[in-house]
Interface confidence: low
Amino acid sequence: GITIPRNPGCPNSEDKNFPRTVMVNLNIHNRNTNTNPKRSSDYYNRSTSPWNLHRNEDPERYPSVIWEAKCRHLGCINADGNVDYHMNSVPIQQEILVLRREPPHCPNSFRLEKILVSVGCTCVTPIVHHVA
Amino acid sequence: GITIPRNPGCPNSEDKNFPRTVMVNLNIHNRNTNTNPKRSSDYYNRSTSPWNLHRNEDPERYPSVIWEAKCRHLGCINADGNVDYHMNSVPIQQEILVLRREPPHCPNSFRLEKILVSVGCTCVTPIVHHVA
């Protein structure tokens, strides 16, 4: 890996669990300030593998609200607007990092957690298993 | 919002920036232990809007490696295996949280950052602008 010299201005850590426990500033820096929040808001409807967005809320997690995609159909929408079952709508999943309050209900102590979320759906050719 | 009583066993925070600066345990809890790591590994190839995955590495970020999807075609793959330009391949994007070392090169001090990543691609009907 790349070895980067330690910045002499770093905060000190006397924590016995260091480097597992770190200080995190929750004042979020958003690198997407110029992006349109509606940038892909209609893809869920215009896709050949459309999806619905479901709200998943958990006050013990940060961010507390996550939107989960659920594919509307097993098949994909064809040119006639009908569901074609020769193709499959499948969720595109991604592992994301969230902060989980630990111990529970603590405002200033968290643990990193990886969760799997469905972001949207795509249309794929099904895998056909030929019986010998 | 929901008011949750504070756990009396919470760590104390004397930090003047509290509650902006919190303690985070980086020993990740993975909620996806039963998921197949190859769960969508071939969707990028089987999709009617296939994509390539590009490695984005930044040692000052946690996680340091993020994979970005880039749609292979402008159009979508039709039943004959050709690109159909009457449809568009578009990236499905998601805002995710990462940790950015702050000050730079510090091993135990981070700031939360939101970044926009393309997770995969989906095939959509293009918006047709009719001229009056």
């Epitope: 940038r39 | 402008l74 159009g75 039709n78 050709n82 159909d84």
Partner: antibody, heavy 115, light 107 residues
């Protein structure tokens, strides 16, 4: 070395026809999406046709129905058939490798539509 | 159609200086932007794709930045061979469109 050489340009009357060719070398032509772009005398750039490696085509409204892109994967040649030419089609025509943007361009062939 | 606006038609810069060329899209193009360099009598040459990715063989004094609607091409330590017209092009939404170009001159 990637090389694209256009030919077939010239002076043509409005309503006339012209067929441009682009000879490609230095890469596996059949594996790449190809495009035609043009640059007007006012130096304005515009894409006029795309063709995927699989043979599918796309045209902007300005040329749809008048221009046809095709390719010969054996001879490694990209074509642009232009009919019903108008004065506004006067431009330097370039062939380029790529579908969304031109990663490599030829030196161009000049098309002048004038009475 | 997405309009691409390059606000400066001409820029005059000293040799060795730094220049910034801007390009503004009429709608969000999510970094799907290319920059080209065109010298008199030559075809355009691709410098940057994906708003920031430098093409192979392009000197490191060229760099791209931006997001959303606003994008920038920067050239540090300007050389005589950088005298050219620079074009941006969006490839987010068909028809793909170019900016009108920014001509760079030496002071």
């Amino acid at each position: 070395e990637v090389k694209l050489v256009e030919s077939g340009g010239g002076l043509v009357r409005p309503g006339g026809t012209l067929k441009l060719s682009c000879a490609a070398s230095g890469f596996t032509f059949s594996s790449f999406d190809m495009s035609w772009g043009r640059q007007t005398p006012e130096k304005r750039l515009e894409w006029v046709a795309f063709m995927s490696s699989g043979g599918s085509t796309y045209y902007p409204d300005s040329v749809k129905g008048r221009f046809t892109i095709s390719r010969d994967n054996v001879r490694n040649i990209l074509y642009l058939q232009m009919i019903s030419l108008r004065s506004e089609d006067t431009a330097m025509y370039y062939c380029a490798r790529g579908e969304r943007y031109g990663s490599y361009w030829g030196q161009g062939t000049l098309v002048t539509v004038s009475a | 159609d997405i309009q691409m606006t390059q606000s400066s038609s001409y820029l005059s810069v000293s040799l060795g200086g730094r220049v910034t060329i801007t390009c503004k899209a009429s709608d969000h193009i999510n970094n799907w932007l290319a920059w080209y360099q065109q010298k008199p009598g030559n075809a355009p040459r691709l410098l940057i794709s994906g708003a920031t990715s430098l093409e192979t063989g392009v000197p490191s004094r060229f760099s791209g930045s931006g997001s959303g609607k606003d994008y920038t091409l920067s050239i540090t330590s300007l050389q005589t061979e950088d005298v050219a017209t620079y074009y941006c092009q969006q490839y987010w939404s068909t028809p793909f469109t170019f900016g009108s170009g920014t001509k760079l001159e030496i002071k």
